[in-house]
């Protein structure tokens, strides 16, 4: 088994990626400048810390969370970093063009980097469904399409439905999940004979995946509170997210044991279920008035996540070709929907409480927002999937799915692992 890239990809990837990077540099040169108005350096540092938390979540958290494959752990971590780095650059430009451009140059602030990191996180969630079946050149396409689709979705939702930064970014869970699932649906599915072992998890990579889950668990309150406008909102979001993820950890571990005939705990269930509360509470984390509600949400989310991890992989593997350990896609799709439903319930309570006869209208708007997010995710995901199937990208042969050796130089290995 050769450890080299196929010649065509060796030509294609550096040329494609470096040309794109050069184009991005030119766009930054002509169309952007820094915010020159920062007066308070202490404030700058505090603001940067939020962005730093998000970067840690993306690079370490999601990077390692997807690294549980026996023979694809290096690629999972490094490809995630590559996509994050590329995605942030494109997201900054895109957000600037969509929101600021008519007034002249795009002003880059720490807030725009924060937004861009969160947009890039969407790709890292989606890619869990396809990692191991695509090469870097294909991932570049995926980054560009998904960040563009999410940026446009957010702008449309902001303008039509009048939602704030937090609300329109919280569609990220549902958007990323459905985008990833629809891309996976387009890619070649069956694993050829003899390669089934590659999509199995191994102890050391599983440990690093657990490390990723821990980083995400620690920083999820930062993610859910990053785009909120006032200190009271951020405080509520941090507290409620913390309570929700704390309960979902307990639920995940005990629920995983309950779901197993011998009462054993599944690593795969735990990897994703520990985050369940954070996803489910995301949309309404700043609105939940008391801890017990967030805790109940965490409990429900943990149970849904464990239940999903037990019963959905079979279906996902058959229909979408997603390996058993890549459960982030359907996990986030279910939990994202749960979060959106909770927000709609709050909306109904709001309009009833205000004595407003427009409950139907308000709920319709929210369902419209959610539907738009799902439709754009599915459409752009299918488009991406079709693009990734083009011969030009020299996709890995099915026999080389989930194999680090296709992409990495291992001097101490002649063949195999």
């Amino acid at each position: 088994m050769s450890s080299k890239y196929p010649r065509s990809v060796r030509r294609c990837l550096p040329l494609w990626a470096l040309t794109l990077e050069a184009a991005l540099i030119l766009l930054f040169y002509f169309f952007t400048h820094y915010d020159a108005s920062l007066e308070d350096q202490k404030g700058l540092v505090a603001s940067y810390q939020v962005g730093q938390d998000l970067t840690v979540m993306a690079a370490i958290g999601l990077g390692f969370l997807t690294s549980s494959f026996r023979r694809h752990s290096w690629s999972s971590v490094a490809f995630n970093l590559f996509m994050l780095a590329l995605g942030v650059q494109w997201a900054i430009l895109l957000d600037g063009f969509l929101s600021q451009f008519p007034s002249g140059k795009v002003v880059i602030t720490l807030f725009s980097i924060r937004l861009a990191t969160m947009s890039a996180l969407s790709v890292l969630i989606s890619v869990d469904a396809v990692l191991g079946k695509v090469n870097l050149a294909q991932l570049v396409v995926m980054v560009l399409v998904e960040v563009t689709a999410l940026g446009n979705l957010r702008m449309v939702i902001s303008n039509i439905f009048n939602t704030d930064y937090h609300m329109n970014m919280m569609h990220i869970y549902v958007f990323a999940a459905y985008f990833g699932l629809s891309v996976a649906w387009c890619l070649p599915k069956p694993l050829p004979e003899g390669t089934e072992d590659k999509d199995q998890t191994a102890t050391i990579p599983s440990l690093s995946a657990m490390l990723g889950a821990l980083f995400l668990w620690m920083f999820w309150p930062s993610f859910n509170s990053a785009l909120l406008r006032s200190p009271i909102e951020r405080k509520n979001a941090v507290f409620n997210t913390y309570y929700a993820v704390a309960v979902s950890v307990v639920t995940a571990i005990s629920g995983s044991s309950l779901a197993h005939p011998q009462g054993k705990i599944s690593k795969t269930y735990v990897h994703s279920a520990v985050l369940a509360g954070g996803v489910a509470v995301g949309t309404s984390c700043h609105l939940i008035p008391s801890p017990w509600l967030a805790m109940v949400l965490g409990l429900v989310a943990g149970l849904i996540s464990v239940g999903g991890a037990k019963y959905l992989p079979g279906c996902c593997n058959r229909v979408l070709g997603i390996p058993h350990s890549s459960i982030m896609g359907y996990n986030f799709s279910l939990l994202g929907l749960l979060g959106e439903i909770i927000y709609i319930v709050l909306l109904v309570l709001d309009t009833v409480g205000a004595g407003n006869g427009m409950i139907g209208f308000q709920v319709l708007l929210s369902i419209g927002e959610l539907s738009l997010a799902i439709v754009i995710a599915l459409m752009s995901g299918l488009l991406t999937g079709l693009l990734l199937n083009l011969k030009i990208w020299k996709a890995p042969h099915e026999a080389k799915y989930f194999d680090d050796q296709v992409f990495w130089k291992f001097p101490h290995l002649a063949v195999g692992f």
């Epitope: 924060r114 009048n162 406008r229 909102e233 609105l287 709050l346 308000q362």
Partner: antibody, heavy 125, light 105 residues
Framework: QVKLLESGGGVVQPGGSLRLSCVAS????????MHWVRQAPGKGLEWVAF????????GYVDSVKGRFTISRDNSKNTLYLQMKSLRAEDTAVYYC??????????????????WGKGTTVTVSS | VMTQSPSSLSASVGDRVTITCRAS??????LNWYQQKPGKAPKLLIY???SLQSGVPSRFSGSGSGTDFTLTISSLQPEDFATYYC?????????FGPGTKVDIK
């Protein structure tokens, strides 16, 4: 006593620049979003710009985008409005105001609970 | 877009005065009312459509939700002659109504 005091207004020619300041006293400004609102002579109130409590995000009315920049120095409890390429229609009394947030059920309500006395900006040749 | 009616009204001390504010789309109860006297800064009266700001006399009250809101002064006092503005906070960027001037009949 909670107070806001604006300064920096004056007469300036079209195309000129001014920097308005607003000093907060009696409260810690770093805990609040801040706004600039203006009122042209004989006209109503027009919201101009806001900045989040931590300075991380800003917003402007379309008519001043690219010309005005809002900023803050929380260590000095001071809010700023840098105005460039001033036009005759920017002539107004400029007020700074403190934003307070109240949790609703499905979103927060924001309102301006403390206002400064205002500073006058006249753009004239 | 916020609209107010009437644009001005004349009333006597002791009168019950009602000012209406209409939003071009539903803003639930995310509406605030301000009072401004000539040469002075605006002052918050009502927030979240119906909550009275502390220190504001109880003769002021607010109601409404969705698109239609009212500010009511149950018994007009001499110090109440001023201009009243509504403001929505449903959108990230605030917008004010054009104002209603209340003067002495």
């Amino acid at each position: 006593q909670v107070k806001l005091l604006e300064s920096g207004g004056g007469v300036v020619q079209p195309g000129g620049s001014l920097r308005l300041s607003c000093v907060a006293s009696g409260f810690t400004s770093r805990s609040y979003g801040m706004h600039w609102v203006r009122q042209a002579p004989g006209k109503g109130l027009e919201w101009v710009a806001f900045i989040w409590f931590d300075g991380s995000n800003k917003g402007y009315v379309d008519s001043v985008k690219g010309r005005f920049t809002i900023s803050r120095d929380n260590s000095k409890n001071t809010l700023y409005l840098q105005m460039k390429s001033l036009r005759a229609e920017d002539t107004a009394v400029y007020y700074c105001a403190r934003e307070k947030a109240l949790r609703g059920i499905s979103r927060y309500n924001y309102y301006l609970d403390v206002w400064g006395k205002g500073t006058t900006v006249t753009v004239s040749s | 877009v916020m609209t107010q009616s009437p644009s001005s009204l004349s009333a006597s001390v002791g009168d019950r005065v009602t000012i209406t504010c209409r939003a071009s789309q539903s803003i639930s109860s995310y509406l605030n009312w301000y009072q401004q006297k000539p040469g002075k800064a605006p002052k918050l009266l009502i927030y979240a459509a119906s909550s009275l700001q502390s220190g504001v006399p109880s003769r002021f009250s607010g109601s409404g939700s969705g698109t239609d809101f009212t500010l009511t002064i149950s018994s007009l006092q001499p110090e109440d002659f001023a201009t009243y503005y509504c403001q929505q906070s449903y959108s990230t960027r605030f917008t004010f109504g054009p104002g209603t001037k209340v003067d002495i009949k």
